[in-house]
Amino acid sequence: HNTTVFQGVAGQSLQVSCPYDSMKHWGRRKAWCRQLGEKGPCQRVVSTHNLWLLSFLRRWNGSTAITDDTLGGTLTITLRNLQPHDAGLYQCQSLHGSEADTLRKVLVEVLADPLDHRDAGDLWFPGESESFEDAHVEHSISRSLLEGEIPFPPTS
């Protein structure tokens, strides 16, 4: 799996989308998990409703929400009030039994708030932004990691 980078601004909301084949994953619940270390387990953050029929219900765990458009084949995760500690590698998963298929690997990057004058040296202005209907969502941009790029900082 390639890793897709989603960038968001600290204090704002970031929306992550994970497209999938709706027929292949028909009837399967989905989950969003955080990768603990390069080879560590993926720790569940939030999952869709236990009733697959109600996957469209937005479920929250703290400041993270998940909702699944099972017809269109898009899993959407919202990270509200993005903080520096939210940065890291995540996965969108499709669940079946005790197994989980990775739908997408996601690297979340948190950028300094350009309106926060305490750190004016780190100003970041989104060059390519997507706007969403959801009022909570401000801006997010995504790209795929280039070959050879490492999602985790090298450990010393």
């Epitope: 469209f56 219900l57 959407t76």
Partner: antibody, heavy 124, light 106 residues
């Protein structure tokens, strides 16, 4: 106005099956999910299952798996709940209740319209 | 399965007084909680959903609060038609109802 009209009271013997109907009117039948909830005499409410009237997909509470079947007839805007292998503990009032249908990223769920209930008595 | 516990089982209140009903979930249900009112021989009626949003046509004297595992339904000034049984229901993980609180005339 939005209405759910249920079939009349039933008296059944242990081991038999019962099929309760719930006819919807006043809204687009296929746009809202339907739930079945039961209430034993003097007891609380117990969720049994859900059906999507559009495609007919169902999910049942684990307790009723294998004994309950929910179906629908879109031509008459009616949903059905059939419970088999009846026992005395199944004596209850059975309600159909409407819940929101498939809407992307709905924040909260609920059951906003209820039928008046169908009394099912299981007795030998 | 998430267990919903309501307290008290019975609440004796005089008309015009305030009634506070409690509902506790065995694990977090976020704000996916609804309150229903049921009178003898009648079907339940939706009062509150999303823990605090009043359903259409519900009087302002009914209010809901809480999130996570602790929820409250408050009836600010009880009217004669409010004496009934009240159920909470979590809709975050399957669907389970609390055992109910009967609000009776003192």
């Amino acid at each position: 106005q939005v209405q759910l009209v249920q079939s009349g009271a039933e008296v059944k013997k242990p081991g038999a099956s019962v099929k309760v109907s719930c006819k919807a009117s006043g809204y687009t039948f296929t746009s809202y999910y339907m739930h079945w909830v039961r209430q034993a005499p003097g007891q609380g409410l117990e969720w049994m299952g859900i059906i999507n009237p559009s495609g007919g997909s169902t999910s049942y509470a684990q307790k009723f798996q294998g004994r309950v079947t929910m179906t629908r007839d879109t031509s008459t805007s009616t949903v059905y709940m059939e419970l088999s292998s009846l026992r005395s503990e199944d004596t209850a009032v059975y309600y159909c209740a409407r819940g929101p249908g498939y809407t992307t990223a709905l924040d909260y769920y609920y059951m906003d319209v209820w039928g008046k209930g169908t009394t099912v008595t299981v007795s030998s | 399965e998430i267990v919903m516990t309501q307290s008290p089982a019975t609440l004796s209140v005089s008309p015009g007084e305030r009634a506070t009903l409690s509902c506790r979930a065995s694990q977090s249900v976020s704000s996916n909680l609804a309150w229903y009112q049921q009178k003898p021989g009648q079907a339940p009626r939706l009062l509150i959903y999303g823990a605090s949003t009043r359903a259409t046509g519900i009087p302002a004297r009914f209010s809901g609060s809480g999130s996570g595992t602790e929820f409250t339904l408050t009836i600010s000034s009880l009217q004669s038609e409010d004496f009934a049984v009240y159920y909470c229901q979590q809709l975050d993980d399957w669907f389970t109802f609390g055992g109910g609180t009967k609000v009776e005339i003192k």
